[in-house]
């Protein structure tokens, strides 16, 4: 082993780290997971501990990037440089960075979690068998639904576990279609659409309309991305394999190595190749996140590369699904930290969380499934995707309240509640609230008292949020709601009556989730809220770091401000925005300064 | 001892082409990072272009297009193939080792660097 | 770009004098900066890397400090072979930038 000059390493040993954003191909969970077991290694043969926390003044700050990506340290397109991480010290120094120009998977092909099926959610196995083929990516052969599915073990037709891979035929996500599946052909600006599409969009994200018609009925999801067929290199990277697909007269259904000596897999972009030409490569086994991960935390935590080849620290990628660590890595991180404190554990076993799944379809090798079985599209935020713009607030006619230092809204350091309504911004403190409309050189207007327009309500709320359609205003406190609708007042209501049970002391915040749906949030746990039924579904009970890794677990309100979510903790912000199928957070700030514009004096 | 030795220098026609060697001796040469770095009759240090120890490359944008970095681990040898030169390309041309390497970073400085060749691009 | 100020331009001193050569950038560079000197006809050679740590073979009278954008090297007591042109360098952003350089001269 080695370490560098002057034996650099971490004056303390309770190790702080922060996943500031995600690469797309892996489900967070699986990335979370993998980064977790990556500092397990460690911290089982030392005596330091690893907490992830959600600021950037972590010791460790894990982030993907690509090329330039902001130090000085370039990253160099696919494979070559992987990922790289800078020594133990203060601000950059101990981050851990990740080229998301490679393909991240464990190791062993593309993870592509499935739905239904029997496999309970598992990921896919590729390669598997089925009828005696092998298939590299997710097909439809078997099927007359046009729904793509894989098998979860390497040969489905020995173990008969399979799952359905993401497809817009099957779900949606985001969108204002509450996850529907598209509606193949539909009319978009008069025109006839058989595919997912990013016309009318500038971000490049592939969408459908779930209805017949989007001129009519203007709804719509966006389509889940396939990494197992989203091709690299050839003259379509990006685009996906079209399966099945025509080279030299016959039909192909899965990837395929003809036409090339090399024998790397690939696949064509059209229905036919001999006629358009387009094609690229299928996605290879990729780079195992937790052993590239597991190396840069050595690094992060002082070790230089070691010049025994079997090491984790030997500076060449070998995937291995043995234990990581040789004894030199385990001298070398000794060394500088000491062994862990008697006694021995024994080695952790940890495993990858499987993402749950619906409930089962009986299979009769692999079924169709049924429309009622179809999945809701998970709950995010709708990316910069309404088809139609907030309406705008009425005139307020609230009286000002005479202004002290403390009515200010810069000098509140934390709201009780913050709402979009209409389209400004509510900042609600103590019976007051200020009203702010984002612009150059714009403040918060206020402060009103809140009892002029909203009489009913108590001085403190927990949370507020506005119900775009029917334009009714939620406002929380304790275990109590109001619902406004213009100025007339439905409540106060228990909490249990919306089906929040007695373990909910609060309400902290609400986020859209597609048509007449909102997220409601108390502490760690979030719920479904249908708007028009004003009831949260039971079942769909979950915990906010599984849909939103990143924010953290005791934020005090939570709301939704030009399609982006927000989580407030302290005087700090935790900006979400959803990309595909991830809700990755892409900024922290101040409330005050950042988003009130308010000066830094 | 670490050394690193530059040639191909010389006089040129404008819109020419030349091709710089650096060998490289007395340290893992496939292991780092290595530079071109250019100073102009009576300038300063200019950055012309680098190559990881993977093959990745980078490259000033007033050399981009022009300029290809490449490298032979096997021969412990650096190269710049300069074509369409110019005028204001006219520099003594250092190849330069750098103290950062793979994906060990947050080291910098380049430690070692060569004479120099000096290339005049002239009609 | 970052753009790496040196000042002053030229710096004119006697031996045995204390030497301070100022380095600026145009933004946070955490403390990615290296010094090097460079006497007529040879090749640069590293002084100070990281801000502040001293190369291999460098004598103890050479000093680097700071961080962010406010960067020093500072020379304890100038002797006959320091006086050279000296450049700064960073490498907290991409692409590397160097300063344009302080003259050190025998007043």
């Known amino acids: 082993f080695q370490t560098f000059e002057g034996d650099l390493k971490w004056h303390h040993h309770n190790i702080t780290y922060w996943i500031q954003n995600y690469s797309e191909d892996l489900p967070r969970a699986v990335i979370d997971d993998a980064f977790a077991r990556a500092f397990a290694l460690w911290s089982a043969v030392t005596p330091l501990t690893f907490t992830r926390v959600y600021s950037r003044d972590a010791d460790i700050v894990i982030q993907f990037g690509v090329a330039e990506h902001g130090d000085g340290y370039p990253f160099d397109g696919k494979d070559g440089l992987l990922a790289h991480a800078f020594p133990p010290g203060p601000g950059i120094q101990g981050d851990a960075h990740f080229d998301d120009d490679e393909l991240w998977s464990l190791g062993k092909g593309v993870v592509v979690p499935t739905r239904f099926g029997n496999a309970d959610g598992a990921a896919c196995h590729f390669p598997f068998i089925f009828e005696g083929r092998s298939y590299s990516a997710c097909t439809t052969d078997g099927r007359s639904d046009g729904l793509p599915w894989c098998s979860t073990t390497a040969n489905y037709d020995t173990d008969d576990r399979f799952g359905f891979c993401p497809s817009e035929r099957l779900y949606t996500q985001d969108g204002n279609a509450d996850g529907k599946p598209c509606q193949f052909p539909f009319i978009f600006q008069g025109q006839s659409y058989s595919a997912c599409t990013t016309d009318g969009r500038s971000d490049g994200y592939r969408w459908c309309a779930t209805t017949a018609n989007y001129d009519r009925d203007k709804l719509f999801g966006f389509c889940p991305t396939r990494a197992d067929s989203t091709v690299m290199g050839g003259n379509s990277a990006g685009e996906l394999c079209v399966f099945p697909f025509t080279f030299l007269g016959k039909e192909y259904s899965t990837c395929t190595s003809e036409g090339r000596g090399d024998g790397r897999l690939w696949c064509a972009t059209t229905s036919n190749f001999d006629s358009d030409k387009k094609w690229g490569f299928c996605p290879d086994q990729g780079y195992s996140l937790f052993l590239v991960a597991a190396h840069e935390f050595g690094h992060a935590l002082g070790l230089d590369h070691s010049s025994v080849p079997e090491a984790l620290m030997y500076p060449m990628y070998r995937f291995t699904e043995g234990p990581p660590l040789h004894k030199d890595d385990v001298n070398g991180i000794r060394h500088l930290y000491g062994p862990r404190p008697e006694p021995e554990p024994r080695p952790p076993t940890t495993t990858t969380p499987q993402p749950t799944a619906p409930p089962t379809v009986c299979p009769t090798g692999p079924p169709t499934v049924h429309p009622s079985e179809r999945p809701t599209a998970g709950p995010t935020g709708p990316p910069s995707a309404g088809p139609t713009g907030p309406p705008t607030a009425g005139p307020s006619t609230a009286t000002t309240v005479p202004l002290s230092p403390v009515d200010d809204a810069c000098n509140v350091n934390i709201f009780d509640a913050i709402a979009e309504i209409g389209n400004q911004l509510y900042l609600f403190k103590d019976g007051k609230y200020w009203r702010f409309s984002e612009g150059r050189g714009s403040r918060p207007q206020g402060p009103f008292l809140i009892a002029d327009k909203w009489p009913a309500l108590p001085r403190k709320l927990d949370s507020v949020f506005e119900e775009r359609l029917s334009k009714k205003l939620f406002f929380f406190s304790g275990r109590q709601v109001w619902v406004y609708t213009g100025a007339s007042v439905l409540g106060p209501r228990r909490l249990d009556k919306l089906g929040l049970g007695a373990d909910v002391a609060q309400v902290t915040g609400a986020l859209r989730s597609g048509r007449g749906k909102m997220l409601l949030f108390s502490g760690r746990r979030l719920w479904r809220f249908d708007v028009k039924a004003q009831m949260v579904d039971p079942r769909s009970a979950s915990e906010v770091d599984r849909m939103f890794p990143g924010v953290p677990l005791d934020t005090h309100d939570v709301f939704q401000y030009r399609e982006k979510a927000y989580f407030c903790q302290d005087r700090f912000y935790w900006r979400v925005s959803s990309r595909s199928e991830l809700n990755q957070v892409d900024q922290v700030g101040y409330v005050t300064y950042d988003i009130l514009q308010c000066p830094e004096d | 001892e670490v050394q690193l030795l530059e040639s191909g220098g010389g006089l040129v026609q404008p819109g020419g082409s030349l091709r710089l060697s650096c060998a490289a001796s007395?340290?893992?040469?496939?292991?780092?990072q290595m530079w071109w770095v250019r100073q102009a009759p009576g300038k300063g240090l200019e950055w012309v272009s680098s190559i990881y120890s993977s093959g990745g490359t980078f490259y000033a944008d007033s050399v981009k297009g022009r300029f290809t970095i490449s490298r032979d681990n096997s021969k412990n040898t650096l190269y710049l193939q300069m074509n369409s030169l110019r005028a204001e390309d006219t520099a003594v041309y250092y190849c330069?080792?750098?103290?950062?390497?793979?994906?060990?970073?947050?080291?910098?400085?380049?430690?070692?660097w060569g004479q120099g060749t000096l290339v005049t691009v002239s009609s | 770009d970052i753009q790496m100020t040196q000042s002053p331009a030229t710096l004119s001193l006697s031996p045995g004098e204390r030497a301070t050569l100022s380095c600026r950038a145009s933004?946070?560079?955490?403390?990615?900066l290296a010094w090097y000197q460079q006497k007529p006809g040879q090749a640069p050679r590293l002084l100070i890397y990281?801000?502040?740590y001293r190369a291999t073979g460098i004598p103890a009278r050479f000093s680097g400090s700071g961080s962010g954008t406010d960067f020093t090297l500072t020379i304890s007591s100038l002797e006959p072979e320091d006086y050279a042109v000296y450049y700064c360098?960073?490498?907290?952003?991409?692409?590397?930038?160097f300063g344009q350089g302080t003259r050190l001269e025998i007043k």
């Open positions: 933004q946070s560079i955490s403390s990615f």
């Open positions: 007395g340290f893992t040469f496939s292991t780092y």
């Open positions: 330069a080792k750098d103290r950062a390497y793979g994906d060990y970073v947050g080291w910098n400085g380049f430690d070692y």
């Open positions: 360098q960073q490498r907290g952003n991409w692409p590397i930038t």
């Open positions: 990281d801000a502040s």
